[in-house]
């Protein structure tokens, strides 16, 4: 699919039993933009790289055992975890007086599960109990899905108080304006 840069060639991670793998760091390779040149970035926001593969929505394979109480699957199941950014960070700086804050330069997309698959697994139980059969729902693919106004609201805290967005969550007024109208106003930040 469009933004799945590493659909089949991601290294398979086999963590210890019960461990959930950490997605790999987004930016390990020093190809980041210079912080000073770009006026810094809001906290918790990864810096850009020029290499799109560094922030593609990718499907990382990992394996885990399915447990149900004391019972555990005979074999581990392979699952996907959706990881990465969907394109460039969509934030632009806005300077007002001496303060600098951030506003969006595009809709916010997140790398999330797209399709799921059901898999039947056999659980082995201790103490001579009969094996149980269970159906588990596993992530089958990922996509870059747009977050709505509602989804974004909880994320404001990541960008500090200057990013507070009172408009979020308000009901749309029954009129439209062109993009030009937003230039003179305080803009929103994701």
């Amino acid at each position: 699919q469009g933004w799945q840069a590493f659909k089949n060639d991601a290294t398979e991670i086999i963590p210890e039993l019960g461990e959930y793998p950490e997605p790999p760091p987004e930016l390990e390779n020093n190809k980041t933009m210079n912080r000073a040149e770009n006026g810094g970035r809001p906290p918790h926001h990864p810096f850009e790289t020029k290499d799109v593969s560094e922030y593609s929505c990718r499907e990382l394979h990992f394996t885990r055992y399915v447990t149900d109480g004391p019972c555990r699957s005979a074999k581990p199941v392979t699952e996907l975890v959706c990881s990465g950014q969907c394109g460039p960070a969509r934030l632009l700086p806005n300077a007002i007086g001496r303060g600098k804050w951030w506003r969006p330069s595009g809709p916010d997309f997140r790398c999330i599960p797209d399709r799921y698959r059901a898999q039947r697994v056999q659980l082995l139980c201790p103490g001579g109990e009969a094996p149980r059969a269970r159906k588990v729902r596993l992530v089958a693919s990922c996509k870059c899905k747009r977050l709505t106004r509602f989804h974004n609201q909880s994320e404001l805290k990541d960008f500090g108080t200057e990013a507070a967005r009172p408009q979020k969550g308000r009901k749309p007024r029954p009129r439209a304006r062109s993009a030009k109208a937003n230039q003179a106003e305080l803009e929103n930040a994701y």
């Epitope: 469009g2 922030y55 929505c57 969509r90 632009l92 595009g106 996509k143 747009r146 993009a179 106003e185």
Partner: antibody
Amino acid sequence: EVQLVQSGAEVKKPGASVKVSCKASGYTFTDYNMHWVRQAPGQGLEWMGEINPNSGGAGYNQKFKGRVTMTTDTSTSTAYMELRSLRSDDTAVYYCARLGYDDIYDDWYFDVWGQGTTVTVSS
Amino acid sequence: DIQMTQITSSLSASLGDRVSISCRASQDISNYLNWYQQKPDGTFKLLIFYTSRLLSGVPSRFSGSGSGTDYSLTIYNLEQEDFATYFCQQGDTLPYTFGGGTKLEIK
């Protein structure tokens, strides 16, 4: 007046590269992401990717990954799209388009388009 | 990728008519649907965003509606300048995708 003016038509051989420019005027260039869309003869529109002029970060349609590079020159308010390893099916009109925003409805759209650059790939 | 289908590739109508152009998405796009007009010289103009919001300066004879996977653009009282090609575009999931276009011709 907000305008996007693109470079002239290009004729290229298969395997070559092309670099199309898009000069913006009438607005603050770094305030809007620039997107690139192409239209093959008699076909629909295909989104290629976007670039944030403020940071230089770009994101591309997976279809073009490895062949396309988008850049900007903020000193001249110009966006560039380079497509490498050209094939005959890359023959198309290439458009730059500004991503505009409506803060009332919290929505985004391509509100300003360039006039298009015809790229012909032929041996 | 989300497929956007404009079933009618061309449509003939007369001045003063009302026409509807449909657009179907391969999955729910949460009303993130925009409509563009392409003139014969290749120039593009945004008409409607978020399914039904008319861009400032666009004549009120243009109207958009729909939800889920089915959307439509209606033009009332067709004028000469409306004869062009119309494209829908979804903004719900990357990559952005467009319909194949519907060419509106004079009958």
